[in-house]
Interface confidence: low
């Protein structure tokens, strides 16, 4: 298959309400119809599926109804929001991106987004 | 087990429209894995890749014959057709229509599924 | 468009016979991007390997593809009576599809 680069954010810091999003920028070689984006953690060198969806040029990233994930595209831009984090799924969060037509296919694998979850402390209780 | 079949006249008078329905059995046409193409064949001669569509109706089409072919897809009915306008002689061939799978491990894509084909002959 | 080339146009062998097919392409396909597929007559084209080097399902092991960039074969090691039929190239590197002109083998 052919190279094809793609360019995510460093680092980003998920909310308090678990909820982190990032922006997956991909160099498409030539007019794409058909994309294929997945987001894959690795932890401690395990590599995992966090959430794919395929999507038609113009048309909205459908992930699986049980999907973490959500997301929008334009252009050669994907928008992408994983919900429901905790500080356990603290990790490298790495955006895979494959052009599925027209051919010939190209797949780029981004860097790597460090994403770093805080659990909430708990309220603490009130005496009224 | 897949099938397809192809049906539509197998006459058709010069400057007229061939139309061409491939009606899929035994799968979704809607399947996002896959795409569907016809293809074609002159008698005694090898084989032209007319064009492809996939189940939201994004359409691919060979230059040679782009400004005379348009494709569609009915995933309602689970079929898919084929128009090729302004016919000629030359257009005489065995139409073939066919699944088009695509082959994550490579990127390839290949036709897996034909249908068994039909003569349309372009005839006054 | 990418142009596939097909060589011998005919090839005449002997049942248990190895044949051997070849395919050129115009310009380079890579190593993946190249179909085989087996014609009977009377029939509609079969695919034997995709890939390059992949066989379909069902296909026997006799069949195997090889080659990258420019240059592919097909191989059948063993030949047997029903594999006397026409085959055809195809790239799916570059729209459009384009196939081979074929290579018919007969019995010799």
């Known amino acids: 298959c052919k190279a094809m680069h793609v360019a995510q954010p460093a680092v980003v810091l998920a909310s308090s309400r678990g909820i982190a999003s990032f922006v997956c920028e991909y160099a498409s070689p030539g007019k794409a119809t058909e994309v294929r984006v997945t987001v894959l953690r690795q932890a401690d060198s395990q590599v995992t599926e966090v959430c794919a969806a395929t999507y038609m040029m113009g048309n909205e990233l459908t992930f699986l109804d049980d999907s973490i994930c959500t997301g929008t595209s334009s252009g050669n831009q994907v928008n992408l929001t994983i919900q429901g984090l905790r500080a356990m799924d603290t990790g490298l969060y790495i955006c895979k991106v494959e052009l599925m037509y027209p051919p010939p296919y190209y797949l780029g694998i981004g860097n790597g987004t460090q994403i770093y979850v805080i659990d909430p402390e708990p309220c603490p209780d009130s005496d009224f | 087990q897949l099938q397809l079949q192809e049906s539509g006249p197998g006459l058709v008078k010069p400057s007229e429209t061939l139309s061409l329905t491939c009606t899929v059995s035994?799968?979704?046409?809607?399947?996002?894995?896959?795409?569907w193409g016809w293809i074609r064949q002159p008698p005694g001669k090898g084989l032209e890749w007319i064009g492809s569509i996939y189940y939201s109706g994004s359409t691919y089409y060979n230059p040679s014959l782009k400004s005379r072919v348009t494709i569609s897809v009915d995933t309602s009915k689970n079929q898919f057709s084929l128009e090729l306008s302004s016919v000629a002689a030359a257009d005489t061939a065995v139409y073939y229509c066919a699944r088009v799978s695509y082959y994550y491990g490579s990127g390839s894509y290949y036709f897996d599924y034909w249908g068994q084909g039909t003569l349309v002959t372009v005839s006054s | 468009e990418i142009v596939m080339t097909q060589s011998p146009a005919t090839l005449s062998l002997s049942p248990g016979e190895r044949a051997t097919l070849s395919c050129r392409a115009s310009q380079s396909v890579s190593s993946s991007y190249l179909s085989w597929y087996q014609q009977r007559p009377g029939q509609a084209p079969r695919l034997l390997i995709y890939g390059a080097s992949t066989r379909a399902t069902g296909i026997p092991a006799r069949f195997s593809g090889s080659g990258s960039g420019t240059d592919f074969t097909l191989t059948i090691s063993s030949l047997q009576p029903e594999d006397f039929a026409v085959y055809y190239c195809?790239?799916?590197?570059?729209?459009?599809?384009?196939f081979g002109q074929g290579t018919k083998l007969e019995i010799k």
């Open positions: 195809q790239q799916d590197y570059n729209l459009p599809y384009t």
């Open positions: 035994g799968g979704s046409i809607s399947s996002s894995s896959y795409y």
